[in-house]
């Protein structure tokens, strides 16, 4: 409970300001989502399984993370793509793979790209193939902001809890 | 010293709860390890050299980071692989490179993959070659949990303090 | 304002130690810079545009981030490189791409690499091509330290706010 074992004034402060940070307190918004492995041709984020979690106000709605309070957050995501041998047919042109974390905010009427990673792979030249993309950064976000992802190459995702994930935490 | 220069009640709180966070206080578990460059065919983590450190309870045992207190931690790691030019007769079969951060916990009798990155490189196709892998995410960890890494392609690691590292910090 | 709505002793503590962390307080050094898209053959960091910011003491001087107070910081950066289609006679010699975050400190008379990622791409073999590099880690930094980047392959950078960035935040 907030304030347990604190001196009276500190206990009172903690009760009034439960977000006051005692190290390792879990009272800081954080989320870690994993890609649903049962959905092979889409990327649906899940919070109620494996190592995934939503904490202290973060929620998942319409496949987007909803920012609980205004502040600076570190936002991150990873995807891993793969392709089998001889997957392309009559082309040697590359496959475009991309992963982006986007912000939808009341301040803007469109999705703003926050983090983008891109790759061209040449399945006709190199098979089987595997490619990982990771990115993360700090952003000033506002309560109610929506964080979502857009991925090019979804059929090629390697969907497991340790390979495809998306998260954020307040600083 | 904890509590120096604080008002009496805050000083008492800080003494009793030394983890209470004053910005830039170093009283938050954090660790940054680097791969030992003197060990060419293994990946041994070191904390007592270069920019590496263990702080506020983190320890390194059996090449694993021991989590000092329960809470949410951001865990990260990077590796860089390279390969020299091969003979013209080099096979065109791919080389599988992978790096994984694993959790060994009293809750599970096996290593759980937390972060995984993978790559196929084709040494016969592209030589010399270089490839970097990075990943990081937030996880709910328990005191006594062990964080370790597993790497495929260790002989190809570019072992330097800025290329091969492993770390974690409490949020 | 620091201390508003706190109990007297906590208010006094917060006034004396304004950096004391109330969750989501912005009183924690953080910075996120983006590569200036108007400068095609150099990588100039900007803080006054798009999602970029400097907070609580961080400043940008001579294209370097100046560390405002001693402590542990998470430092990160990303770059994305691309290359256009070449003629069939394009050289098959590789292009070396690298990105490094460096520390210049009063403790050392030279730039120390903190984070390094590297890649060889073969433009004659695979065109067009795209490649992303990301890295980040926790470092013990000292007030006045300078964080900068060095990039090989600057003409190939894909300069946008979501693809090329550099940042840090105090833990």
């Amino acid at each position: 409970l907030p304030g347990v074992g604190l001196t009276p004034s500190a206990a009172q402060t903690a009760r009034q300001h439960p977000k006051m940070h005692l190290a390792h307190s879990t009272l800081k918004p954080a989320a870690h989502l994993i890609g649903d492995p049962s959905k092979q041709n889409s990327l649906l984020w899940r919070a109620n399984t494996d190592r995934a979690f939503l904490q202290d106000g973060f929620s998942l709605s319409n496949n987007s993370l909803l920012v609980p309070t205004s502040g600076i957050y570190f936002v991150y995501s990873q995807v891993v793509f793969s392709g089998k041998a001889y997957s392309p047919k009559a082309t040697s042109s590359p496959l475009y793979l991309a992963h982006e974390v986007q912000l939808f905010s009341s301040q803007y009427p469109f999705h703003v790209p926050l983090l983008s990673s891109q790759k061209m792979v040449y399945p006709g030249l190199q098979e089987p193939w595997l490619h990982s993309m990771y990115h993360g950064a700090a952003f000033q976000l506002t309560q109610g902001d929506q964080l979502s992802t857009h991925t090019d190459g979804i059929p090629h995702l390697v969907l497991s809890p340790s390979t495809v994930f998306f998260g954020a935490f307040a600083l | 010293l904890p509590g120096v220069g604080l008002t009496p009640s805050a000083a008492q709180t800080a003494r009793q709860h030394p983890k209470m966070h004053l910005a830039h206080s170093t009283l938050k578990p954090a660790a940054h390890l680097i791969g030992d460059p003197s060990k060419q065919n293994s990946l041994l983590w070191r904390a007592n050299t270069d920019r590496a450190f263990l702080q506020d309870g983190f320890s390194l045992s059996n090449n694993s980071l021991l989590v000092p207190t329960s809470g949410i931690y951001f865990v990260y790691s990077q590796v860089v692989f390279s390969g020299k030019a091969y003979s013209p007769k080099a096979t065109s079969s791919p080389l599988y490179l992978a790096h994984e951060v694993q959790l060994f916990s009293s809750q599970y009798p096996f290593h759980v993959p937390l972060l995984s990155s993978q790559k196929m490189v084709y040494p016969g196709l592209q030589e010399p070659w270089l490839h970097s892998m990075y990943h990081g995410a937030a996880f709910q960890l328990t005191q006594g949990d062990q964080l370790s890494t597993h790497t495929d392609g260790i002989p190809h690691l570019v072992l330097s303090p800025s290329t091969v590292f492993f770390g974690a910090f409490a949020l | 304002l620091p201390g508003v709505g706190l109990t007297p002793s906590a208010a006094q503590t917060a006034r004396q130690h304004p950096k004391m962390h109330l969750a989501h307080s912005t009183l924690k050094p953080a910075a996120h810079l983006i590569g200036d898209p108007s400068k095609q053959n150099s990588l100039l960091w900007r803080a006054n545009t798009d999602r970029a910011f400097l907070q609580d003491g961080f400043s940008l001087s001579n294209n370097s981030l100046l560390v405002p107070t001693s402590g542990i910081y998470f430092v990160y950066s990303q770059v994305v490189f691309s290359g256009k289609a070449y003629s069939p006679k394009a050289t098959s010699s590789p292009l070396y791409l690298a990105h490094e975050v460096q520390l210049f400190s009063s403790q050392y008379p030279f730039h120390v690499p903190l984070l390094s990622s590297q890649k060889m791409v073969y433009p004659g073999l695979q065109e067009p091509w795209l490649h992303s590099m990301y890295h980040g880690a926790a470092f013990q930094l000292t007030q006045g330290d300078q964080l900068s980047t060095h990039t090989d392959g600057i003409p190939h950078l894909v300069l946008s706010p979501s693809t090329v960035f550099f940042g840090a935040f105090a833990l």
Partner: antibody, heavy 114, light 113 residues
Framework: EVQLVESGGGLVQPGGSLRLSCAAS????????IEWVRQAPGKGLEWVGE????????NYNEEFKGRATFSADNSKNTAYLQMNSLRAEDTAVYYC???????WGQGTLVTVSS | DIQMTQSPSSLSASVGDRVTITCKSS????????????LAWYQQKPGKAPKLLIY???TRDSGVPSRFSGSGSGTDFTLTISSLQPEDFATYYC?????????FGQGTKVEIK
Amino acid sequence: EVQLVESGGGLVQPGGSLRLSCAASGYTFSSYWIEWVRQAPGKGLEWVGEISPGSASTNYNEEFKGRATFSADNSKNTAYLQMNSLRAEDTAVYYCADGYHGYWGQGTLVTVSS
Amino acid sequence: DIQMTQSPSSLSASVGDRVTITCKSSQSLLYSTNQKNFLAWYQQKPGKAPKLLIYWASTRDSGVPSRFSGSGSGTDFTLTISSLQPEDFATYYCQQYYSYPRTFGQGTKVEIK
């Protein structure tokens, strides 16, 4: 079911322009190149070029560079071929194709005549 | 540009015949590092779009009858129809996708004798 459906063909005057559409359905569109191939009446197949919808990268047959422009709208899963300065010899059935999966559209006829 | 030359330009055959069409490229289509030939064969019937039959010179596309086979390497390639069926009367094209621009052979028309 995977489908590529071309539209926008018809009669055009010499010197005129035309924009052809290729609407894709039944598969994820953005990662795979869309190729444009044409076939003049009674003749063989001629490759015009290709576009990667996700990255907007393009490759053109030099014979069409300057007159052909590829574009794509990922939100509509549609690729476009804009042809300018049309001549009688541009009369052909224009096909879009996805070579990665081996899909072809049914084609759309462009007739350039006064 | 890589030139693709098919022969014959047309042929007459009967149902049940074994038919062979050849395709020569002006440079090798073999990618040495993975030992694959960047060549496809298409079938086209009047008023219809081309249909992919064979890719990587010898891999049959899904749903293509086993009587169709592709062979060859480097610059010389062959499409074989082991036992011609009524629905096989069509024009056949080879295409290289080794380099830009992609190029097609001029076509081989298979007619009923």
